[in-house]
Each structure stands twice: as C-alpha cells, then as structure tokens.
Interface confidence: low
C-alpha cells in the first residue's frame, strides 16, 4: 500500500512484498527489502520502544537507496504497520503484518499493565477500547464489570478491527469501572490488559440571567427570568431558583437543553422563571441555582415592582448651570420613573436635535460652550405608557473671560509726539461684566534694559514693576475717566479710558480686567518723540480704492534726511534694550518707499501717496529722519488700516403696516457698507419727496409721515447704494378710516 | 475641543537645557490658560508652570522659578516651556494642559499624552 503526496518525479518507494497484508506465523522471520530513487528509511511498530534490538536494517548489497527490514523470530506483539519512506517526504509505502500468536492474540502495549478510557455519557458519542489484535479475524467480546456485562458485535455501531480496537456507544459501558476484551481461539479464552473506565464532565463554566440588573415592572405585568448555565459537555445540571413570593399561583418553571454549534465543546442548560402576573410581593431578589452534582454556581439580580407607571425628576437635577465659553458642558436629565421615560430637550421652546456640537440625550452634553448657547433649557419626560409628562428648566450661564479689543488692532510700537494729550483706551467684553478695570504704569526705560530679563515676541514686557496710575511721579499726569457702557458690535462692553494730559516721557501703560471667571489685560507702549510727526491725509481710516497720503513733518532746523519705510510681514525680532520701538536699529525688516518731499518756512514734509488702497498695503509705515547735529536716527511709526470695501445691507426688515387717517407712521431703514451707501426711500416705485407731511432725518435713515392720509397708502421702499450695487426693503402701508374734508387740504 | 500634542522630551545630562514644545488644534486656543504639569514615578502630578489666555501673566512653581519659562504663540496655537539648569529631580513626564484658569490642576479641561524627559546625574 502507498501513502503520501507524489513529489518531484519520485517514485514510490518499492517493497519487495506485493501486498496491503501481510500474514506470518509466530517464530518466523520476517524480512521485507524496499528500493528507491534517494534515501530511505523505515517505521515499525513500536519502533519507539526496545523492541529495536531484534529488527535490524541494513544497505542492500546490490545497489543504491535499497533498505532490507529483518526481525527473526516475530512474535504477535510485532503485528502492525510497516512503512518505508523517503527521508524528509511524505511518499512512503506501508505494509500491514499480522504475527499470529494463537496464545497471545492481543498487541500488548509495552509499558502498560492496564490502560484508561475516558468516556463522556453522550448518546451519540463512540468510545474505542484499543485493544488490537496480531490475528485479523478474531471473534472479539467486551466485558465490562461491575456488574459483569459481555458486548459482542452486531455489524452497526459494536464493532471489532484489529488494527484499530473494540468501538461501542460510549454510554453502554459508563457504569462500569473497567473493561477488557476477549477472544475465543479453539474454545480457549483469552485476553487483552484491563481498561480503567473514566467518566469525564462536570465542569459549569458560567450561570447568567437574563435580564441581568435593573430589572422594573408594574403589577400585572410579566416578569421573565432566563437562566443560562454553560457547561463542558457531558454534564447534567440541576436548577434550583429563590425567589421572594414562593406561595405563587402563575409561576411557572421551564428547564431545557439549548442546541450548540456542532463541534461545540460546550454544552448550554436554560431555566426560565415565568411570573404571569407580578404584585408588589414579588418585588426581591430572584437567584438561579445551577448544579451539576460536583459543582454549582449561581447569580442573582433584583427584581422591582411599581404599584403603576410613573415618571419624575429625581432630587439632583439641576436648575442653573454656570460655564466657561469653550468648556464641555454635561446636563444629565435626573430622573426616575418606569419605565424609563422618552427625553426631549428644547432650548427656549425649539427642540434640539443632536449634531457634532451637541448631544441631546440622557444627557445633554454642549462640547465646546459658547456665549451663545446662554439660555434656558427644558427637558420633557415622557413616560411611554400612561402618557404622563415632566418638565424642569435648567439656566445655562456661560461666563467670558474679558477679552480687549483693542488688543489686536493697536500696532505695539505707535508713537505719540511730545506735549500732546493723549487718549489711550481698553474696550473689554466680558461676561459677567469686569467687576474692575484697573490701570498701571512703568517708565519704558525700566522695563526695556534690564538685561536679566529674558524677552520674546510673546512677551515683549518683562518687567514687573507695574505703578498705580495714581502715582505718576516721575511720569505722565494722569486722569482716568469713569468707565463707559457701550453697545458695539451687539454686544455690551465697558470702555475704560485713561488721559494723559501732556506726553513728556515714554512709558508702558497695562489696564487690566477682571471678572469671576479670568482676567485679561492690554499692554500699551506709549513711546514719546520729539522726532517726525505724522499725520494721514484725507481720513485716518481710508477704503479700498480710495487715495491716502501719509504725511511725514519735521523741523528743519533739527532734521535732515527723511525717509518712508514699511515694516515687512514678519513680527521684529525684538531685543533686549530695544524695546519698544526698535525698527530704527534694524533697517533690514524695512522696505524703503518713494516719497515726495515739500517744505514750508519751518518744516520739511515727506508725503508717502497711496493710490487706490489696497488691503496689501496695511500695516505700520516707519518715518525716519536724522538729527542735524548728532547724527542720531529718530523714528515713528503709524500703523495705517485700510477697509474693506462692503455691498450695501439693510438691517432689519420694514414691516406691513396699518395706520388709521390723521396718526402718524414712523420708519427707520439703518444700512451698513463700506463706502457707506446712500440711503432714498420710494412709493410705489416714485422717488418719495419730502413736504410738510413727510419728513426724512439722519441721512434719510428715518421717515416720518405726519397726520397720514388715505392717498398715503401704498408701497414703501428703503433703497442702500453705493458703488459697489444695491440693497432694498420693501413694506406696504395700509391707510383705514374715511378721509374728513377740511380748509386745511 | 483641544486636542494637545507634547514634544521635545529626552534624555539629557544635569545642567543641560530643553525645550518642551504642545501643539494645539481645535478652535479658541487663544481663550485658554496653558500649563505644564509633570509627574514622577509614584508622585502626584504637579503644576510646573502655568501663562494666562493672555499670555500677560506667568506662574511658575518654587521648585523651577528662574530656570523655567513658559511662552505661548496664539498664531501657532503653542505652548513652550524652556527648561534650564535641568537636575535630576526634574525628570518626569511632562504635561500640557489647557483650561481657564491658571493654578487648580483639577480645573484644566484638555490634556496632552505626555513626553518623558531624564535628566542623568
């Protein structure tokens, strides 16, 4: 016989005896030669054991990858298997040998003096007692004991092979503590070593119920409990349930096998505890109880029973909520009820949908807060059977830490010409408002040459030293204004303004704001020159498009050599000591422009023109001129902002309107753009003209018709322009009552 | 929501120099406080140092006043803190952390993965 996968070109190996089975008596020698194409090898039975002494293998005289197998004097323990085999192959070829040995019809196994059989008592299972025999056709009993039990084939599922052993329904022999075979050879018994016979399957892996926790009903509805206990396989198991109300008519127990994947080693057990109808006596705690006789496990959960549904806001739940802007926000909606209730969350009465801002669910979770989410919240419960409903308002606060305007659009090295009064100002929006804006003061020596101190561009004053405005000795007179509340932007900000009354020395001005939730504060360098003054010609903020002259003076008896520069895109490289107006030690971040130089009787004027500005041409421009006598470069520097150019808009929509004969109607259209837009108002498409009865103010934002009249009814329109287009509004005017005929008309 | 990326941790001999760098992205970096917290092994996390949304105003702990700064670039949306003079003491992993206010390690909000820095004696 030939086993194995064919490989490159090889031919099995050939064995000089032609046969699947071979059959010799005992005593006998048995020599089989096997040839080949490479080298070879043999396998016999129990070549593991010492029983290699007797065999020997030895080269063929007459050639190449030959092998001649020799055991003398075979006895019927050399029954089994003989296989020759390329090395590192799988190609072989096998034959089968009985020795027969009629006083020894059973291979022994060398090392045991009785053997194990492990069964489990599965109906389908098959157990094989492997007592195989040197004689193939045997007639072969089991006998198992105690009680001695005999089982002989019966050509279906007992069964009898030589080479493999005695098969039979594993169940069939698992009372038995041992088993053995028997073989009748002319009326001679004989038989194979004892097989010890152990049952195996006890093991519960694990018991859960279903539900597991929070298990809520209301009296009269059903309680289902599954219990599940998971086991190895072979294992019976035993459920045992406690439970509050034992003394129950509706309840009703359940205990079946559950079917596994085939394959499975594991094996499920399912109890389930039926309560038909639960009253409040059944409310406890409920424990499964699974046993498979070396082992039990259990779990447990309770059970609550409400006399009816219900829904209400549990003690927690919160009525205001203060945050920070950016901070996440949790709201959870604290309740109890059952079942659990539907929740709707709705912010000033619109529901809230969830998105990738919020969550509105069993919590309402804001991720980043913003001011505008400032409001009142209301959560509704609803419960899913009675219908009944719950609502509760939480007050979201959002808190803003002051923020100053100004901070960003103020150039850091603006100069101020010496002997001015100066207006210097802190714009801070906060929530709650700033409960103090407070200004400080350092001269702009003390501060910027102190080498120890290490200075970055993110913060250019190092200096702590920071004075009390109320005590300007040594500096600027000082008078702080008493702070302002402004509405800019839509929103209410505090406007704290600090005057110097004569700039005589350079300084470092700081207001800072506080509130509950942060601080903020606004460093200003007020950097005093004698130098260069430079004013803008024609407006100090132009629009695109529009033409700006800067304009740089300079007595001429002083200075010499003016020059306009822009400082580049990139912030200064600010050093120690050169704090806060370097750009005169550091020409390099300057660009030089072409200037027009006129001069009066006392002054030279350097005028830098800007035709039609463009957004590129912000920034701060750098005027420098030179001291006749000491050569010492001086420096100003004015930051020019250009604005965008914005299309016409109305803000605010006219609205129908009806007015009786003899009232009044007043109207305002307020339009915004940049340039700003003209405003002209039409009736019925026709160029309103003001009379004694129609009144148009403040640039025609405002339209008044006094003591109406019915030929006043018709169509209104507020009409925005500028050259970049149009914006209109439209609103017709309703005129009621008759109209009474009098000398006036 | 801010999420924190550290950088610029290492090994690195008593005496030496570092610069921890926390890279910031998520909007409003600039309304936040920022701080550097640290934790040695089977210590509590403390605050290192700490510069306001502002950046006008800095804290530092005893421990590394005058040998550690803090700076911030809103442009950038980061944080630095320059460690000089380092000791062995110092060796920890650093955290960057964002919130609104400056001192109570419990209040900051948003918190870097951490970088390891060893100062070898």
């Known amino acids: 016989a030939s086993v194995g996968l064919p490989s490159v070109s090889l031919d099995l190996p050939r064995l000089s005896i032609q046969k699947d089975i071979l059959t010799i008596k005992a005593n006998t020698t048995l020599q089989i030669t096997c040839r080949g194409q490479r080298d070879l090898d043999w396998l016999w039975p129990n070549n593991q054991s010492g029983s290699e002494q007797r065999v020997e293998v030895t080269e063929c005289s007459d050639g190449l990858f030959c092998k001649t197998l020799t055991i003398p004097k075979v006895i019927g323990n050399d029954t089994g298997a003989y296989k020759c085999f390329y090395r590192e192959t799988d190609l072989a070829s096998v034959i089968y040998v009985y020795v027969q040995d009629y006083r020894s019809p059973f291979i022994a196994s060398v090392s045991d003096q009785h053997g194990v059989v492990y069964i489990t008592e599965n109906k389908n299972k098959t157990v094989v007692i492997p007592c195989l025999g040197s004689i193939s056709n045997l007639n072969v009993s089991l006998c198992a004991r105690y009680p001695e039990k005999r089982f002989v084939p019966d050509g279906n599922r007992i069964s009898w092979d030589s080479k493999k052993g005695f098969t039979i329904p594993s169940y069939m022999i698992s009372y038995a503590g041992m088993v053995f075979c028997e073989a009748k050879i002319n009326d001679e018994s004989y038989q194979s070593i004892m097989y010890i016979v152990v049952v195996v399957g006890y093991r519960i892996y694990d018991v859960v119920l279903s539900p597991s926790h929070g298990i809520e009903l209301s009296v009269g509805e059903k309680l289902v409990l599954n219990c599940t206990a998971r086991t190895e396989l072979n294992v019976g198991i035993d459920f045992n349930w406690e439970y509050p109300s034992s003394k129950h008519q509706h309840k009703k127990l359940v205990n079946r096998d559950l079917k596994t994947q085939s394959g499975s080693e594991m094996k499920k057990f399912l109890s389930t505890l039926t309560i038909d109808g639960v009253t409040r006596s059944d409310q406890g705690l409920y424990t499964c109880a699974a046993s498979s006789g070396l082992m039990t496990k259990k779990n447990s959960t309770f059970v609550r029973v409400h006399e009816k549904p219900f829904v209400a806001f549990g003690s927690g739940m919160e009525s205001l909520v203060e945050a920070t802007v950016g901070e996440r926000v949790r709201i959870p909606a604290k309740y109890l009820g059952y079942p659990p209730p539907e929740i709707k969350w709705y912010k000033n009465g619109i529901p809230l949908e969830s998105n990738h801002t919020i969550k509105a669910g069993h919590v309402l979770t804001i991720m980043e807060v913003s001011e505008r989410d400032t409001g009142n919240y209301t959560v509704i419960l609803t419960n899913p059977i009675s219908k009944e409903k719950q609502s509760h308002v939480v007050s979201l606060v959002v808190y803003v830490p002051p923020q100053i305007g100004e901070k960003s659009l103020i150039s850091p090295v603006d100069s101020y010409q010496y002997g001015t009064t100066q207006t210097l100002t802190c714009t801070v929006y906060a929530i709650p408002p700033p409960h103090h804006i407070h200004w400080y003061w350092q001269l702009e020596e003390e501060c910027a040459n102190e080498p120890s101190q290490a200075v970055s561009v993110t913060n250019p004053y190092p200096c702590e030293e920071w004075r009390s405005v109320e005590d300007f000795q040594g500096g600027n007179k000082i008078e702080v204004n008493k702070n302002q509340f402004a509405l800019i932007e839509g929103k209410n900000k505090t406007v704290s303004t600090l005057v110097i009354q004569a700039a005589n020395v350079s300084a470092l001005y700081k207001c800072e704001a506080v509130n509950k939730v942060g601080r903020g504060e606004r460093v200003i360098s007020f950097h005093v020159t004698r130098g260069p003054e430079i004013t803008l010609q024609p407006d100090m903020q132009p629009t695109e498009q529009e033409s700006v002259s800067l304009w740089c003076t300079a007595d001429r008896s002083t200075f010499e050599n003016l020059t306009w520069y822009k400082l580049g895109p990139q912030p200064l490289p600010i050093h120690v000591g050169e704090l806060p107006t370097p750009v005169c030690k550091n020409l390099d971040t300057l660009w030089k422009l072409n200037a027009t130089m006129f001069s009066n009787s006392t002054n030279d004027i350097l005028i830098m023109e800007l035709k039609n500005a463009s957004l590129q041409d912000q920034g701060d421009y750098v005027c420098l001129a030179q001291d006749r006598k000491t050569k010492k470069r001086h420096c100003v520097v004015r930051q020019l902002t250009v604005l965008e150019r914005v299309a016409p808009t109305i803000t605010g929509n006219l609205e129908n309107q009806t007015t009786s004969i003899g009232e009044s109607i007043e109207v305002s259209c307020t339009a915004s753009g940049n340039p700003p837009p003209q405003i002209m108002w039409f009736k019925d498409n026709e160029t309103l003209v003001e009379d004694s009865g129609i009144v148009l103010k403040d640039g025609n934002r405002n339209l008044t018709i006094r003591r109406v009249r019915k030929e006043d009814e018709g169509l209104y329109t507020c009409q925005a322009c500028s050259v970049l287009g149009c914006a209109k509004v439209e609103a017709f005017f309703i005129i009621e009552g008759a109209q009474e005929k009098t000398n006036l008309e | 929501q801010v999420q924190l990326v550290e950088s610029g941790g290492g090994l690195v001999q008593a005496g030496g120099s570092l610069r921890l760098s926390c890279a910031a992205s998520g909007r409003a970096f600039s309304s936040y406080a920022m701080g550097w917290f640290r934790q040695a092994p089977g210590k509590e996390r403390e605050l290192v140092a700490a510069?306001?949304?502002?950046?006008?105003?800095?804290y530092y702990a005893n421990s590394v006043k005058g040998r550690f700064t803090i700076s911030r670039d809103n442009a950038k949306s980061a944080v630095y803190l320059q460690m000089n003079s380092l000791k062995p003491e110092d060796t920890a992993v650093y955290y960057c952390a964002a919130h609104k206010s400056l001192q109570r390690p419990d209040e900051y909000t948003y918190w870097g993965q951490g970088t390891q820095v060893t100062v070898s004696s």
């Open positions: 510069i306001s949304w502002s950046d006008d105003s800095t």
